[in-house]
């Protein structure tokens, strides 16, 4: 997260760290007791490593009573996701067992009504992604409030030049932005999960390259079918 601040500890009990061989790789969001939603491209970076999900964490390194690392029973990328595009960049991870719920671990309601968030709406994005262009990684969860950007502006040639589909949304990126390592994390508007940070090599913090988020409402049928 660029231009953000440290989050209030455990105030986002849905927040997950998707880890490979014990290292944070991507963000994720607990959407059901045994399921974490993340970004499909995160699996590509995992190679053959052991994928696990950390829940109930604020600090990645310090012991915390609520922290627990779960093995992944099943990884289900969206069937249409492909390495060369950010389309359908969603991944569902089934935990090896149901998460132990409590004040620091709780699923987040996700948007099912397929309607665009009003441009200008302030939404919260959180993650353990880099906090500087130099690539500094934070130990504690960071967050930032970002205004939603209308799709027409996001599709301008100097922004994303027509790449933003109806199944994506954008948020402003003027110095405050999601960045590398935040992929798969939640974009939360009015207490509801609206978007998932897409993965990719997008430049961060440049206002002409807005953050791109996969709209979960657009994938309600798929999510329901996997969770069923």
């Amino acid at each position: 997260i660029l231009g953000g601040r440290e989050a209030e500890a455990h105030a986002r009990p849905y927040m997950a760290s998707v880890q490979v061989n014990g290292e944070h790789l991507c963000g994720g969001v607990l959407v059901a007791e045994q399921w974490v939603l993340s970004a499909a491209h995160c699996l590509e970076d995992a190679a053959d490593g052991k994928v696990q999900v950390l829940l109930g964490a604020h600090s990645l390194s310090q012991p915390e009573p609520s922290k627990r690392l779960y093995d992944v029973l099943r990884a289900v990328p969206h069937p249409d996701s492909r390495p060369d595009t950010i389309d359908h960049d969603l991944l569902l991870l089934q935990l090896s067992e149901k998460a132990t719920l409590g004040p620091a671990v709780r699923p987040l309601p996700w948007q099912r009504v397929d309607r665009d968030v009003e441009p200008g709406t302030l939404c919260d994005v959180a993650g353990w992604g880099i906090v500087s262009h130099a690539g500094r990684r934070p130990d504690r969860l960071q967050h930032v409030l970002l205004p939603v950007l209308d799709r027409a502006t996001c599709n301008r040639r100097t922004h994303h030049d027509g790449a933003i589909t109806q199944r994506m949304m954008c948020a402003e990126s003027n110095r405050r932005d999601s960045c590398k390592g935040d992929s798969g994390g939640p974009l939360v508007c009015g207490g509801v999960l609206e978007g998932v940070v897409t993965s990719g090599s997008r430049v961060c913090g440049n206002r002409k390259k807005p953050g791109i988020y996969t709209r979960v409402a657009s994938y309600a049928a798929w999510i329901d079918s996997v969770l069923a």
Partner: antibody, heavy 116, light 112 residues
Framework: EVQLQQSGPELVKPGASVKISCKAS????????MNWVKQSHGKSLEWIGD????????SCNQKFKGKATLTVDKSSSTAYMELRSLTSGDSAVYYC?????????WGQGTLVTVSA | DVLMTQTPLSLPVSLGDQASISCRSS???????????LEWYLQKPGQSPKLLIY???NRFSGVPDRFSGSGSGTDFTLKISRVEAEDLGVYYC?????????FGAGTKLELK
């Protein structure tokens, strides 16, 4: 399939105004800016301005300030350009073109002829 | 405004020839985001312009690979490796990095 269908040719008198239309189909109208371009006979292309269909916000080439007014009607997915105080120098083909990807999609053009 | 100067204004060719069109901008068209929004369009008589190349060297979908774009900063080139009859028309370079966006005067590719 993305299509931009423009209104037909116009023959107008000097000093009058004309409003030409560009009806979009094959995509969500509010997802892309609409731009307008002028091409005088046998000449190059000149950018007039653009409009964000979400909020009607416009940006205009200084050269066309006071000459062109851009509007949209979201309900019919149609962009409009009104040209006022017409002179012979405004006789041209006017194109609408969708922004993103680049200017990949153009209307067929509307010929405006200004003549007494 | 950024002036886009194309040379030559007329380019007589024989079918199968290689053709090269130059475009020079009056100032750098590298955008503040690091990208260069230099595009090439082809307009055939009685038709609307068609996008060929975007961001200097990227062919738009469906554009044959005999078309290639190159250049940087202020100097850009469009090359057609083997001219076919359907390639004849007026070629325009365009910059989208600075407002107002501007087109070159055009280069007419015609048969000798």
């Amino acid at each position: 399939e993305v299509q931009l269908q423009q209104s037909g040719p116009e023959l107008v008198k000097p000093g009058a105004s004309v409003k030409i239309s560009c009806k979009a189909s094959g995509y969500t109208f509010t997802d892309h800016y609409m731009n307008w371009v002028k091409q005088s006979h046998g000449k190059s292309l000149e950018w007039i301005g653009d409009i964000n269909p979400n909020n009607g916000g416009t940006s205009c080439n200084q050269k066309f300030k006071g000459k062109a007014t851009l509007t949209v009607d979201k309900s019919s997915s149609t962009a409009y350009m009104e040209l006022r105080s017409l002179t012979s120098g405004d006789s041209a083909v006017y194109y609408c073109t969708r922004e993103g990807a680049s200017f990949a999609f153009w209307g067929q053009g509307t010929l405006v002829t200004v003549s007494a | 405004d950024v002036l886009m100067t194309q040379t030559p204004l007329s380019l007589p060719v024989s079918l199968g020839d290689q053709a090269s069109i130059s475009c020079r901008s009056s100032q750098s068209i590298v955008h503040s985001n690091g990208d260069t929004y230099l595009e090439w369009y082809l307009q055939k008589p009685g038709q609307s312009p068609k996008l060929l190349i975007y961001k200097v060297s990227n062919r738009f979908s469906g554009v044959p690979d005999r078309f290639s774009g190159s250049g940087s900063g202020t100097d850009f080139t469009l090359k057609i490796s083997r001219v076919e009859a359907e390639d004849l028309g007026v070629y325009y370079c365009f910059q989208g990095s600075h407002v107002p966006v501007t087109f070159g005067a055009g280069t007419k590719l015609e048969l000798k």
